[in-house]
């Protein structure tokens, strides 16, 4: 009933509550000397399915008959209209529209822990639309039966709050799940299990590793379980991967030795549970362990390479390069290098730790035969010494690789490829490609990359260190045995044209020619390799095109010679520069007017 | 000190109902579980039902699951027994008991006489066929 009603009733057959798809039957009458004033037949009732007008009879009473209700709960009001004056409000009354429940699904019933409670949970089918009430039972030895309500709109969860205990592990417990509601109910299939199928262990907790020793090849987990445990299982993992190893374990008691981890490593480890070998589950996995693995000695041996500069009739700078060993060969922090420094004739040597760089320049006669052996130290030894012997790498020309190219290769990658030297191909025994920025100053300070590649291979792909817009010195060594020969090329991954002409900074008069000197373009503004100077000059004030003169581009040319310029011509000069994606736009420009006598 | 005294025992005949009450006073009602015993002559006392603190969890004896229902009405300090259905073995003196609560609930937490720390007199039920 919607209100007190006073004037009349609403009565609804056969129940407020129905099925979908079936028909009402809703009767509203006045109760007596509640009509208009004056004629009964002059009342008018009124039915409202929620606001909306259904059906009205002039008299004491209506009655009407409803089908197609949907599901849900919709309002009737029936309201009396009388001659003069507003309608007024009967009686109302509510009607719910549902289904009886569905048989619940796949009922399961899981006990969190040893000291855990039994909670079960279940599919509920399609909504009823009504108020539902489940009731879970779960009966057990002893005859007993515990019995749960749960009145949430939705229930498909509820706990008993009851522990099962492994007295007797094997006892058979079944769990029913049983939803009524007005229009009927429906009990779940039996769930039938034991205390050992349906106690999902904690994840383990305090977990520890220990390292005999401070060696990784002696490693041991421990951690702590619940009292029933029978199985576990291991995953760990090195902190950068994302594939698990995976280790099954027998009573192992809390602890399980560890054979197979990579020194000075990062691990995660994670544990999990089981009371049973088939029966129950597995525990959530537990919380995860980070540690780091103790230092090994470094294996492996350093990559080395070298530089040697001409100082002086007696004396040579050598400049030595190593790549830093991998993780796993390094196996530890590394803590200094040892550069080792040996006259092999005289017997002479120098010995040096190198801490923070991965060079080392010296100054040596240029007389005796020099080599060095690089290794690399961490806390617990030394790698392998890297030997090698000093020697001019470009000195024998029938060694040199010929017809060396550079090109582009997609983004800030350059392929550099070659033909074997004339001289026995198969004498060679390695190729070293080595790169490093163009730098027209000849900057020894400018990191020096090199990839070594086998005797048979005839390119190489560089990337490492490459940055678009830049030109780099590319050279080909070809080795073999105590001999090296060489070749270079200009190469760029990506170029455009220069962002600026060079700059004429002086132009000097020599016997009837001008001499023509500028400032390098600032490497910045090179935008690749150049390729070509361009001098042009026009006589002022002429609207004639400009004459010009274009220069192959060496890296340490910074002047030239014209003398096609007539004597007392005033001419003014400027200067551009080309990449192989075209041409700058034009430097600063220079009068100048030649004094020489006229022919 | 909790006393509890029980009510609603009587003659009824095989087929018939009852509704025990059990009124509770000197004590925190709703801080206990509730549980009904029975004894009939010459036997040992024997479990029948018992409701837990919230009143939502409850636990039968199956020989009587589904004709007995337990009940609670914390506000009253009342615990109920609604008997439906009656059957002769059902004759017994009725108990009503109070459980203090225990850290942990197990499957048989509450179904033993010795869970419980205060007892009722008992009222007599007994069902003519």
């Known amino acids: 009933k919607i209100d007190a009603c006073k004037r009349g009733d609403v009565t609804v057959k056969p129940s407020h509550v129905i099925l979908l798809g079936s028909t009402v039957n809703i009767t509203c009458s006045l109760k007596p000397r509640q009509g208009c004033f004056h004629y009964s037949r002059r009342n008018k009732l009124i039915l409202y399915k929620f606001d909306r007008r259904i059906n009205f009879h002039h008299g004491h009473s209506l009655n009407s008959q409803v089908t197609g209700l949907p599901l849900g709960t919709t309002l009737f009001v029936c309201k009396l209209a009388c001659i003069n004056s507003d309608e007024i409000q009967i009686c109302g009354a509510e009607i719910f529209v549902g289904v009886a429940p569905e048989q619940p699904q796949n009922l399961s019933c899981i006990q969190k822990g040893e000291q855990g409670t039994v909670a079960c949970t279940w599919e509920r089918g399609r909504d009823t639309h009504l108020y539902t009430e489940y009731t879970l039972q779960l009966s057990g030895p002893k005859n007993l039966t515990w019995q749960k309500q749960c009145k949430d709109i939705y229930c498909d969860y509820l706990d008993f709050g009851i522990n099962l205990t492994p007295e007797s592990p094997e006892s058979n417990f079944t769990a029913k799940v049983t939803a009524v509601n007005s229009l009927g109910s429906s009990s779940s299939l039996p769930s039938t299990f034991t205390f050992l199928d349906i106690v999902r262990p904690l994840p383990p907790w305090d977990i520890r590793i220990k390292f005999q020793k401070a060696s990784v090849s002696r490693c041991t987990l421990y951690w702590r379980d619940e009292g029933l445990v029978l199985l576990n299982r291991l995953r760990y993992r090195p902190s950068n991967s994302r594939l698990w190893n995976m280790v099954n374990v027998t009573k192992a008691k809390g602890r399980h030795d560890l054979l197979d981890l990579k020194p000075f490593t990062e691990y995660e480890f994670q544990i999990s549970s089981k009371l049973h070998l088939y029966k129950g589950s597995w525990s959530d996995w537990s919380e995860s362990l980070r540690a780091q693995t103790p230092e090994e000695e470094p294996t492996g041996m350093l990559d080395v390479w070298y530089m040697k500069r001409h100082i002086d009739y007696s004396r040579q700078q050598i400049s030595l390069f190593w790549k830093n060993l991998s993780v796993s060969e390094a196996r530890g922090k590394i803590l200094h290098y040892q550069v080792t420094l040996q006259e092999l004739t005289g017997g002479k040597a120098m010995t040096q730790n190198i801490t923070g760089h991965t060079s080392w320049t010296t100054v040596i006669p240029r007389t005796g035969n020099w080599a060095v052996a690089v290794s690399a130290a961490n806390s617990k030894g030394s790698s392998l010494p890297t030997r090698i012997n000093i020697m001019n790498l470009c000195e024998a020309g029938l060694l040199a690789p010929r017809q060396v190219s550079a090109n582009s290769e997609g983004m800030d990658n350059i392929l550099v490829t070659w033909q074997p030297p004339r001289k026995d191909p198969s004498a060679v025994q390695e190729y070293v490609v080595e790169w490093r920025e163009l730098h027209p100053g000849g900057d020894t300070q400018v990191p020096l990359n090199w990839l070594r590649s086998r005797p048979y291979n005839v390119s190489a792909l560089i990337s490492e260190n490459i940055k678009s817009y830049i030109c780099y010195e590319i050279r080909v060594y070809a080795l073999s045995g105590d001999q090296g020969g060489c070749s270079s090329i200009l190469g760029n991954s990506k170029h455009k044209a220069p962002l600026s002409g060079p700059h004429i900074n002086a132009i000097t008069e020599e016997k009837g020619s001008i001499l023509i000197s500028w400032n390098s373009i600032p490497v910045q503004e090179q935008m690749g390799c150049l390729l070509h100077y361009r001098i042009y000059w026009k006589e002022r004030d002429s609207n004639s095109q400009p004459q010009l003169c274009e220069i192959p581009y060496r890296v340490s040319q910074n002047s030239h010679p014209i003398n096609s310029l007539q004597p007392r011509v005033t001419y003014v000069l400027w200067m551009t520069a080309l990449t192989a994606a075209g041409e700058s736009s034009h430097g600063n420009e220079r009068e100048f007017c030649l004094q020489g006598k006229a022919n | 000190q909790v006393q509890l005294v029980e009510s609603g025992g009587g003659l009824v005949q095989a087929g018939g109902s009852l509704k025990l009450s059990c009124a509770a006073s000197?004590?925190?009602?709703?801080?206990?579980?509730m549980g009904w015993f029975r004894q009939a002559p010459g036997k040992e006392r024997e479990f029948v039902a018992a409701?837990?603190?919230?009143?939502?969890?409850?636990v039968y004896v199956n020989s009587v699951k589904g004709r007995f229902t337990v009940s609670r009405d914390n506000a009253k300090n009342t615990v109920y027994l609604q008997m439906n259905s009656l059957k002769p073995e059902d004759a017994a003196v009725y108990y009503c008991?109070?459980?203090?609560?225990?850290?942990?609930?197990?499957?048989?937490?509450?179904?033993?006489?010795?869970?419980?720390?205060?007892w009722g007199q008992g009222t007599q039920v007994s069902v003519s066929s």
């Open positions: 008991a109070a459980g203090r609560p225990v850290s942990r609930t197990s499957y048989y937490t509450y179904t033993y006489p010795h869970d419980y720390d205060y």
């Open positions: 409701i837990m603190r919230s009143g939502g969890t409850t």
């Open positions: 000197g004590g925190t009602f709703s801080s206990y579980a």
